[in-house]
C-alpha cells in the first residue's frame, strides 16, 4: 500500500497534485525575481533570479519562528505562489508600562513561561493584575497600557497614622482586624512566637494585630509562606532579634542591628559584614565554616554572616574564652 498515487514519481510538495515532470518548459531568461520575505524573516537560498518550479525557504530571525507554510514556489508567469507564512516571536518583549510601575525581573526579553511582577511605590497598589506570564509572543493576561497605581486601601484608611492604625477624628487608633480588614491586602508570611508556628496572613490583619500589642507576631517576608531560604532566614532572624539593641520600624517589618531600612522599598536589607560598626556589647563566640579556631563577633557581624548564608556555628553568647 502506498499513500502516493504515482509511486516513485518526484513530487514538488506533499500538498500539491502537480509533479516536477509536469512543469512547463522553462525559457532561458524567464523565472522569478527575489521574493519579499515576511517581517522578521529572510530567504535562506538567496539569489537574484529563480527558475520556474524552484522553491525558496523562508527562515526567521533569532527569537522568531515560522508559522504557516515556509516555502514559496516560482510560477511560469514570474510570480510566486506563497501560502500564509509569518515570523512570530518566541519571546516576549519587556512590556511598556507607565513609569510609576516597576517591573521585576527587569529584562529586555522573557522566554515563554517566564513571569513578571508589577509593583508600585510605597502606599500604592497595582490597579489590576500584578503578575503576568509570557505565552508565545504575548503576555497573559494582556497588559493594558493604561494600567497604573492606585492608593492602597490600607493607606487610605490610615490617613496620617502609622501602618495598622486609622484616623478617628484627630487621633490615631488601632484598626480592628475584623471590621477594618475586609478589603484585599497583600499576603505576608508571619511567625507567632507563642505558638512557635508560621502562617500566611493578610497585611491588614497582621498590622492591626501588631498595633493591638500582639508582640508575639513577627514579619518574616512578603508573600505567602513557602519553604525555602527566605523562610529559613526569617525564622533564624526572629530568634536573633531578641538580643538586638536596634529595633527600627520599616514598612511591615522591624530592622535589627545587622540591617538597614531601605528608604525606597521600606524593607529591611542585611548589611554586609564590613558595614558593621564595632560598638555594642552583644558578642558571640563562633566557629566559621570548617575552621577549628574560635572567633568573637558582634551581633551585627553574626546577623550579616547568617543572612549571607555563610556557614557559622554559634558556640555561646559573649567573648570567646581563649
Amino acid at each position: 500500500f502506498s499513500i502516493m498515487e504515482n509511486n516513485g514519481q518526484p513530487c514538488i510538495n506533499d500538498d500539491e497534485e502537480m509533479k516536477e515532470v509536469d512543469l512547463p518548459e522553462i525559457e532561458a531568461d524567464s523565472g522569478c525575481p527575489q521574493p519579499v520575505p515576511p517581517e522578521n524573516g529572510f530567504i535562506r537560498n538567496e539569489k537574484q533570479l529563480y527558475l520556474v518550479g524552484e522553491d525558496v525557504e523562508i527562515s526567521c530571525l533569532t527569537g522568531f519562528e515560522t508559522v504557516g507554510y515556509q516555502y514559496f514556489r516560482c510560477l511560469p508567469d514570474g510570480t510566486w505562489r506563497q501560502g500564509d507564512v509569518e515570523c512570530q516571536r518566541t519571546e516576549c518583549i519587556k512590556p511598556v508600562v507607565q513609569e510609576v510601575l516597576t517591573i521585576t525581573p527587569f529584562q529586555r526579553l522573557y522566554r515563554i513561561g517566564e513571569s513578571i511582577e508589577l509593583t508600585c511605590p510605597k502606599g500604592f497598589v497595582v490597579a489590576g493584575p500584578s503578575r503576568y506570564t509570557c505565552q508565545g509572543n504575548s503576555w497573559t493576561p494582556p497588559i493594558s497600557n493604561s494600567l497604573t497605581c492606585e492608593k492602597d486601601t490600607l493607606t487610605k484608611l490610615k490617613g496620617h497614622c502609622q501602618l495598622g492604625q486609622k484616623q478617628s477624628g484627630s487621633e490615631c487608633i488601632c484598626m480592628s482586624p475584623e471590621e477594618d480588614c475586609s478589603h484585599h491586602s497583600e499576603d505576608l508570611c508571619v511567625f507567632d512566637t507563642d505558638s512557635n508556628d508560621y502562617f500566611t496572613s493578610p497585611a491588614c490583619k497582621f498590622l492591626a494585630e501588631k498595633c493591638l500589642n500582639n508582640q508575639q507576631l513577627h514579619f518574616l517576608h512578603i508573600g505567602s509562606c513557602q519553604d525555602g531560604r527566605q523562610l529559613e532566614w526569617g525564622l533564624e532572624r526572629t530568634r536573633l532579634s531578641s538580643n538586638s539593641t536596634k529595633k527600627e520600624s520599616c514598612g511591615y517589618d522591624t530592622c535589627y542591628d545587622w540591617e538597614k531600612c531601605s528608604a525606597s522599598t521600606s524593607k529591611c536589607v542585611c548589611l554586609l559584614p564590613p558595614q558593621c560598626f564595632k560598638g555594642g556589647n552583644q558578642l558571640y563566640c563562633v566557629k566559621m565554616g570548617s575552621s577549628t579556631s574560635e572567633k568573637t563577633l558582634n551581633i551585627c557581624e553574626v546577623g550579616t554572616i547568617r543572612c549571607a548564608n555563610r556557614k557559622m556555628e554559634i558556640l555561646h553568647p559573649g567573648k570567646c574564652l581563649a
Epitope: W233, L271, L272, K278, G279, N309
Partner: antibody
C-alpha cells in the same frame, strides 16, 4: 569630618616592594573595617583587600593573594598595604576606603599612585 | 567573577537633558533572601569616587534627588533627570552580591 590620606606610592621595578599608608581622622578608626581599592591608569576600579576592626580577619582579591598584606595600627589610626613581588599590572592609584551602613566604600581618600615599571 | 557591562561608554549631553546609564550583570545580583547589593558611584575629574546610589535605588547621603536608580536581577539603570554641569565625570556601577566585589568599566558623561 571623615578624612583618609594615602601615602607611600611611587615608582618601583617589577618584583620590587612598596608599603602604602592611609592616615585616618574624623572618626573612631578602630570601630570600622577598612579597605583598599585601586584604579589602573585610564581603567576602572578594582577592590583589593579588606581588614576587620582589629586585623584578625583579612580578605584579598585572588590576583594579590600571597603578595599583598593589609594591616592596621589602631593606636596610630593608620591602615597599611604591604605590596611585594610587584607586577606591571599592579600599576594603579590606590585608594583607602571606609564603609558606612550605606555602602562598603562610602568614604574614599584621594589616592596614591603606584607605578611598576623597569 | 561577576562581570558588569555598562552602556553607553560615553554620553554627551546638554544641560537639562535627562539621561540613563545601563548596567547589566553576568549573573543575577538578587540573593536568596531577596537582597540586591548594587551601587552607583560618580568619579568627577581629578577626584576620588563618591557614592550616589546604594541597594539599587536608595539615594546616598547628600546626593541630589535628580539621581535615581532602578532595576532588578541582572538589569539596572541610573537616571539623571536634568543633567547639570557639575554631573560630568565617570559613572560606575558596583556589585557586592557575589565575592569578589566588582565594578563596571564606567560611563563617561560630558557636557556638549
Amino acid at each position: 569630618e571623615v578624612q583618609l590620606v594615602e601615602s607611600g606610592g611611587g615608582l618601583v621595578q617589577p618584583g620590587g616592594s612598596l608599603r602604602l599608608s592611609c592616615a585616618a581622622s574624623g572618626f573612631s578608626f578602630s570601630d570600622y573595617y577598612m579597605a583598599w581599592v585601586r584604579q589602573g591608569p585610564g581603567k576602572g576600579l578594582e577592590w583589593v583587600a579588606t581588614i576587620n576592626y582589629d586585623g584578625s580577619s583579612t580578605y584579598y582579591r585572588e590576583s594579590v593573594k600571597g603578595r599583598f598584606t593589609i594591616s592596621r595600627d589602631n593606636a596610630k589610626n593608620t591602615l597599611y598595604l604591604q605590596m611585594n613581588s610587584l607586577r606591571s599590572e599592579d600599576t594603579a592609584t590606590y585608594y583607602c576606603a571606609r564603609p558606612s551602613t550605606e555602602a562598603l566604600f562610602a568614604y574614599w581618600g584621594h589616592g596614591t599612585l603606584v607605578t611598576v615599571s623597569s | 567573577d561577576v562581570v558588569l557591562t555598562q552602556t553607553p561608554l560615553t554620553l554627551s549631553v546638554t544641560p537639562g537633558q535627562s539621561v540613563s546609564i545601563s548596567c547589566r550583570s553576568s549573573q543575577s545580583l538578587l540573593n536568596d533572601v531577596g537582597n540586591t547589593y548594587l551601587y552607583w558611584y560618580l568619579q568627577k575629574p581629578g577626584q576620588s569616587p563618591q557614592l550616589l546610589i546604594y541597594l539599587v535605588s536608595d539615594l546616598g547621603s547628600g546626593v541630589p534627588d535628580r539621581f535615581s536608580g532602578s532595576g532588578s536581577g541582572t538589569d539596572f539603570t541610573l537616571k539623571i533627570s536634568g543633567v547639570e554641569a557639575e554631573d560630568v565625570g565617570v559613572y560606575y556601577c558596583m556589585q557586592a552580591s557575589h565575592a569578589p566585589y566588582t565594578f563596571g568599566a564606567g560611563t563617561k558623561l560630558e557636557i556638549k
